[in-house]
């Protein structure tokens, strides 16, 4: 059986969440994906997803968030970045594989940012004045907003998440449309 | 061409210290994990510990854990084995590898460290 | 941790014979309908190759008749027929959980 489980993560405004989503299989290299919160009461709701297909080393950016699917180690790269207070809340990662019901990438995540600059490593005080150049074509996210709650009761594997400082200057205004932007060197 | 490559196998007395470097090429290791594994003479396969080097995030077998460090420096997209308090039962070619399937894949050639006194 | 346990611990065989490689875990190794089981080939001097990873799926570039089977604790490695350079040493190792960890290994020699 299914063990569903949360791993609980608690970091300050201003760091990074980074997540490694282990997708185990190769025949899940090129679907969909997809990076949701749970709010109680509601269905998983999507906060940004990679292209469809989903490309090899393809950054994807929505707002804060960073996907980055990297085909050749069968993993998922999940960033937010300058973490608010009101990010807390419980995430999950899913493959998009219609017709058929998508399913989670690993156990769910349990955020919880507090206020307060830790002054840790791993964080980044000055994130909020980090300016990146949008390039200007978009594309709009092609992904749904909402999910099934059949998708809580399907899944593959495992993730690890830490504070990181952010790999590149970003814009953190609100987007939402999906940017492509420059691999993160 | 994906490639790893141990360095900095010695031979070292008991109680010493040993860094070991695992060089890779071909890809940048921030965006997968890097895993250590070594191999005792004429042994099995132990599983040390890995590392995410996007965020330094680590985990360790225990029966290394507080001994061994492993780390990360992306700018030279190098990992590290820091091994301290060495004893002879750490004798082994040690093992860089890197990930793929849940699993470990792209090994290097393994380097030897030997502890004796 | 799991402690995964190989049988049997050499097997002698020919070329051209099937080979049947057992792997025991003290618990499952499944979890999100996916069975975290591998198994690695190692040649003496060489570091080892992955065969067989998540149970059923072959590594990037290993011939066809190395196949895997299984589920939960139970797992089987296959060499449909033997080619000269497939007498090695042969290990499982599960995934699911911290600290991974290897079987003892399977030395398949020629008979």
């Known amino acids: 059986a299914t063990k569903l489980t949360e791993e609980k993560y608690e970091l300050k405004e201003g760091q990074t969440l980074d997540v490694k989503c282990d997708y185990t299989l190769e025949k899940f290299a090129s679907s969909q994906k997809a990076w949701q919160i749970i709010r109680d009461g509601e269905m998983p709701k999507t906060l940004a997803c990679t292209e469809r297909p989903s490309k090899n080393s393809h950054p994807v950016q929505v707002g804060r968030i960073i996907l980055e699917d990297y085909h050749d180690h069968g993993l998922l790269r999940v960033r937010m970045v300058n973490l608010q207070v009101e990010d807390s809340g419980l995430y999950q990662c899913v493959i998009y594989q219609p017709p058929k019901e998508p399913h989670m990438l690993f156990d769910r995540i349990r955020l919880v940012v507090t206020k307060g600059f830790s002054g840790t490593p791993g964080s980044n005080e000055n994130s909020t004045q980090n300016v990146y150049k949008i390039p200007p074509t978009t594309t709009k996210a092609l992904c749904p907003l909402y999910t099934s709650p059949r998708t809580v009761t399907q899944a593959p594997p495992k993730s690890t998440a830490d504070v990181s400082t952010p790999d590149s200057e970003i814009n953190l205004t609100n987007v939402t449309d999906i940017i492509r932007v420059p691999v993160f060197n | 061409e994906v490639q790893l490559v141990e360095s900095g196998g010695a031979l070292v007395k008991p109680g010493g210290s040993l860094r070991l470097s695992c060089a890779a090429s071909?890809?940048?290791?921030?965006?997968?994990?890097i895993h250590w594994v070594r191999q005792a003479p004429g042994k099995g396969l132990e599983w040390i510990g890995r590392i995410d080097p996007a965020n330094g995030n680590t985990k360790y077998a225990p029966k290394v854990q507080g001994r061994f460090t492993i780390s990360a420096d992306t700018s030279k997209n190098t990992a590290y084995l820091q091994m301290n308090s060495l004893k002879t039962e750490d004798t082994a070619v040690y093992y860089c590898t890197g990930h793929y399937g849940s699993t470990m894949d792209y090994w290097g050639q393994g380097t030897l460290v030997t502890v004796s006194s | 941790e799991i402690v995964l346990t190989q049988s049997p611990a050499t097997l002698s065989l020919s070329p051209g014979e099937r080979a049947t490689l057992s792997c025991r875990a003290s618990e499952s190794v499944d979890n999100y309908g996916i069975s975290f089981m591998n198994w690695f080939q190692q040649k003496p001097g060489q570091a080892p190759r992955l065969l067989i990873y998540a149970a059923s799926n072959q590594g990037s570039g290993i011939p066809a008749r190395f196949s895997g089977s299984g589920s939960g604790t139970d797992f089987t490695l296959t060499i449909s027929s033997l080619e000269p350079e497939d007498f090695a040493v042969y290990f499982c190792q599960q995934s699911k959980e911290v600290p991974w960890t290897f079987g003892q290994g399977t030395k398949v020699e020629i008979k």
């Open positions: 071909g890809f940048n290791i921030k965006n997968t994990y």
